[in-house]
Structure formats: structure tokens, C-alpha cells
């Protein structure tokens, strides 16, 4: 493994439709890819009216945009879908939304706001 | 590498059975979702349900529920179609595929494709 | 069900040209998004996956992008070996559905 990369070979499993599907509704998934493809983990919900419903969770396969993220945190503004993903065995186990802020000057200090977590 | 290797050619009579095979050799078979695919001469794909072997129990498309049973046996990594009551429309090329994942990321190998003809 | 839709059915194109699928979901299906190419009387191959993925051995000149009920598949510069039928297949939820296809022609 390449040093300071987080090896991911499982990951938390959950179906919200899992009875439609026939599956279980939660477990652990381990990932499999090709040997020089990286392996991620990735949370997908909702929100509906302040209360979280997951949807998805599960194993993601070499996606840039999951590259080198230890946290799994959701950073678009308000999407219809929530998914963020992570490097890290069963780093899908908690997930957050941390909007991105459009960059304007401050008239005062920046605040940086914790990120809410969910899990 | 995974592969995936099915049954040979059916012809079939309408109202008979077909049971497809499909034999996985590389990784972990017990752990892959296996899907299966038809395709009808000159048409498009149909998700026919899936299978995650160590889970045992198989998912289908409503429209072939109660006339589809997708199995695996895991001590010979095959996975298996059997689609009764046949009919000439079930005249297709059937594809056993593994999925990426569990969470049915993509559809990344195919078997070669089992052709079965239904006619009297 | 999830109903697909692509646009267009057929088109035509040169060696060299960029190309655009479109593929629409009848409900949203958040990146559970895949792109397969077939040849005729070969199985399809998965071309991308999660709505802008490429697996490997898949050519950059492939590109996906969409989320939730609108996707897009853009092949730049053309290849004489990307002539083929394009289908989009969503698994976001059961039952997986296909798109009905776009076929890609010479021109």
C-alpha cells in the first residue's frame, strides 16, 4: 500500500428497500476491484423535513472525487440526494453535510461551522 | 479476474422449461451480486433479478415473478436461470453478469450468452 | 417502475467528431447511473458507472456527467471502433431498467 493512503476492503452495508430486494438490510460489504483501482466507501440519504433517511451504504469503486477523503461528508448545497464517500475501512459508518460556501468577502471574522454528523 | 462462462444453445418448446448455468472462476463468487440479462433479437436489455449467493435469496423483476427462480451453488461457483412456462416471446440471448458491488454500482462482466429459442 | 429515455435513437457521425447521448430516468436515481456499449453479437460493456466513472480500460475519450434524472454520455473524438449501440441502465432501484438504446453510425 502506498504510504498515507487509507486501504479500504470494507465497508458498512445498508438497504433501505431491502425487503423489495431481497437483501439484508445491513452488514458489512467488502469491496473487490481491480489491484490497481482504489476502493472507497459512500453514504447515500435524504432529508426529509430535518429527519435523515438513509437510503444507501455500501462500497464505491475508484472515484477521484472519494480520493484521499478520510470523512464521508456531502459538500453540494442542498441536493435532492445526499451522498458523500471516504477512504478508510467502514468509514461510511457516520456521514455529515458541510455545504460549500460560495466565497464572498467577509465583513467580519469567518466562522467555520461543525459539520453535522449522522450515523 | 473473474470470468463467466454459461451453458451452451436451448430450443425449447412453449410451455416447457430452460435452466441456464453460469460457472464464475477468479474471485469470490460467494460475494458478488449476479444479475441476469436477456436480450430479444434486435431489442433492447432486460433486468431479469439478481442473486447475492452468501445471502442465498434471489430479487426478480415483477414481470417475471413466478416464472423465474435465479439460484447459486456456491461450492461449484455457478449461479443458474430457470425460467419456466416458455413462450415464443422468451426467444432471447440470456447474459449472466457480475455487479461491482452489492449496491449495483454497474454491471462489469458478462458472460459469453446463452441463445434459447422457443418453438413448436 | 423507472422508466429510461435516450436521445436520440440513431444518429450519425464522422471519425474525429464529439458525440452526446442523452439518457433521462422518470424518477430520480441519484448517480446510480451506468453507460454500456454492445457490437453487435457480442455482450454489452460497462463504459461507465455511477453516472461518470470509467472503469478500467476504458478510453478518456469517454465522459459521463447527470445526477438524479438527467445524464449525458460524450464521446470526443471518435474512433472508427466506437460505431456501436449506446444503452444507459439505471439500478437505483429494482426493478434495473435499460434505456431503449442509441445507435451510433458512420456518417
Known amino acids: 500500500a502506498i504510504l498515507g493512503r487509507s486501504e479500504t476492503q470494507e465497508c458498512l452495508f445498508f438497504n433501505a428497500n431491502w425487503e423489495k430486494d431481497r437483501t439484508n438490510q445491513t452488514g458489512v460489504e467488502p469491496c473487490y476491484g481491480d489491484k490497481d483501482k482504489r476502493r472507497h466507501c459512500f453514504a447515500t440519504w435524504k432529508n426529509i423535513s430535518g429527519s435523515i433517511e438513509i437510503v444507501k451504504q455500501g462500497c464505491w469503486l475508484d472515484d477521484i472525487n472519494c480520493y484521499d477523503r478520510t470523512d464521508c461528508v456531502e459538500k453540494k448545497d442542498s441536493p435532492e440526494v445526499y451522498f458523500c464517500c471516504c477512504e478508510g475501512n467502514m468509514c461510511n459508518e457516520k456521514f455529515s453535510y458541510f455545504p460549500e460556501m460560495e466565497v464572498t468577502q467577509p465583513t467580519s471574522n469567518p466562522v467555520t461551522p461543525k459539520p453535522p454528523y449522522y450515523n | 479476474q473473474v470470468q463467466l462462462v454459461q451453458s451452451g444453445a436451448e430450443v425449447k418448446k412453449p410451455g416447457s422449461s430452460v435452466k441456464v448455468s453460469c460457472k464464475a472462476s477468479?474471485?469470490?463468487?460467494?460475494?458478488?451480486?449476479i444479475s441476469w440479462v436477456r436480450q430479444a433479437p434486435g431489442q433492447g436489455l432486460e433486468w431479469m433479478g439478481g442473486?447475492?449467493?452468501?445471502?442465498?435469496?434471489?430479487n426478480y423483476a415483477q414481470k417475471f415473478q413466478g416464472r423465474v427462480t435465479i439460484t447459486a451453488d456456491e461450492s461449484t461457483s455457478t449461479a443458474y436461470m430457470e425460467l419456466s412456462s416458455l413462450r415464443s416471446e422468451d426467444t432471447a440471448v440470456y447474459y449472466c453478469?457480475?455487479?461491482?458491488?452489492?449496491?449495483?454500482?454497474?454491471?462489469?462482466?458478462w458472460g459469453q450468452g446463452t441463445m434459447v429459442t422457443v418453438s413448436s | 417502475e423507472i422508466v429510461m429515455t435516450q436521445s436520440p435513437s440513431s444518429l450519425s457521425a464522422s471519425v474525429g467528431d464529439t458525440v452526446t447521448i442523452t439518457c433521462r430516468a422518470s424518477?430520480?436515481?441519484?448517480?446510480?447511473l451506468a453507460w454500456y456499449q454492445q457490437k453487435p453479437g457480442k455482450a454489452p460493456r460497462l463504459l461507465i458507472y455511477?453516472?461518470?466513472v470509467l472503469p478500467s480500460g476504458v478510453p478518456s475519450r469517454f465522459s459521463g456527467s447527470g445526477s438524479g434524472t438527467h445524464f449525458t454520455l460524450t464521446i470526443s473524438s471518435l474512433q472508427p471502433e466506437d460505431f456501436a449501440t449506446y444503452f444507459c441502465?439505471?439500478?437505483?432501484?429494482?426493478?434495473?431498467?435499460f434505456g431503449p438504446g442509441t445507435k451510433l453510425e458512420i456518417k
Open positions: 453478469v457480475k455487479d461491482l458491488t452489492w449496491t449495483n454500482l454497474g454491471l462489469d462482466i
Open positions: 477468479g474471485e469470490s463468487f460467494e460475494h458478488f451480486q
Open positions: 442473486i447475492i449467493p452468501i445471502y442465498g435469496t434471489a
Open positions: 424518477q430520480g436515481v441519484s448517480r446510480w
Open positions: 455511477g453516472a461518470r
Open positions: 441502465q439505471q439500478s437505483y432501484s429494482t426493478p434495473f431498467t
